[in-house]
Amino acid sequence: TPEVWVQVQMEATELSSFTVHCGFLGPGSISLVTVSWGGPDGAGGTKLAVLHPELGTRQWAPARQARWETQSSISLALEDSGASSPFANTTFCCKFASFPEGSWESCGSLPPSSDPGLSAPPTPVPILRAD
């Protein structure tokens, strides 16, 4: 069964900078990836970025840079302009779509105990979708 993992990390040098890493574990090719925060895509979450494997990326503030790391994983850099660092308590969700086979989504957040600069362990929250 395909799975999606989500990893959130705070940058050591800039505490207002976060990076979300997402990956797809499974067969098949990915046709589109959407990243949202505050909840799953289409269910109360706010879109941060959409990535197409061949045709580019689209992103919205506070997303700073969305890019492919491998054919099945992406990263999204975020700039937190607020002093209260709301990202630290935010859920980030990634949805990997393989049209028309199906889509798989998972969510994760920065563990409250994680130290700046250390990679937070993956905290996937599988969301079953019957596409």
Epitope: L32, D41, G42, G44, V50, R58, A97, S103, D131
Partner: nanobody
Framework: EVQLVESGGGLVQPGGSLRLSCAAS????????MGWFRQAPGKGLDEGVA????????KYADSVKGRFTISRDNAKNSLYLQMNSLRAEDTAVYYC??????????????WGQGTQVTVSS
């Protein structure tokens, strides 16, 4: 929960017509395009057969121009595809999808289960 449900498929003779419908429910639409895509038996997925973006711009595949018409009813949260002068090569599973525009084409983010269209005498 996102749900896009297609209907209206079936068996039709060459030269006949069909109207496909797609009803969206529980859908928080945040993309910028919707459209119809198809996959013929034993073949790969076609680029959008007919797509429409949020500005109302419509795009058709060359193979269906002049025969297919896409439309939408925002009040009913529905998308339609009127298919006329159907040919055997139009036989496929048709998917209703919502997504994002990249490079001038609509890339699906959400889609339905598909409806079978068979053109045969």
């Amino acid at each position: 929960e996102v749900q896009l449900v297609e209907s209206g498929g079936g068996l039709v003779q060459p030269g006949g017509s069909l109207r496909l419908s797609c009803a969206a429910s529980g859908y928080s639409y945040s993309g910028d395009c919707m459209g119809w895509f198809r996959q013929a038996p034993g073949k790969g997925l076609d680029e959008g057969v007919a797509t429409i973006d949020n500005a109302g711009r419509i795009k058709y595949a060359d193979s269906v121009k002049g025969r297919f018409t896409i439309s939408r009813d925002n009040a009913k949260n529905s998308l339609y595809l009127q298919m006329n002068s159907l040919r055997a090569e139009d036989t496929a599973v048709y998917y209703c999808a919502a997504g994002w525009t990249f490079g001038g084409q609509c890339s699906p983010a959400d889609w339905g289960q598909g409806t079978q269209v068979t053109v045969s005498s």
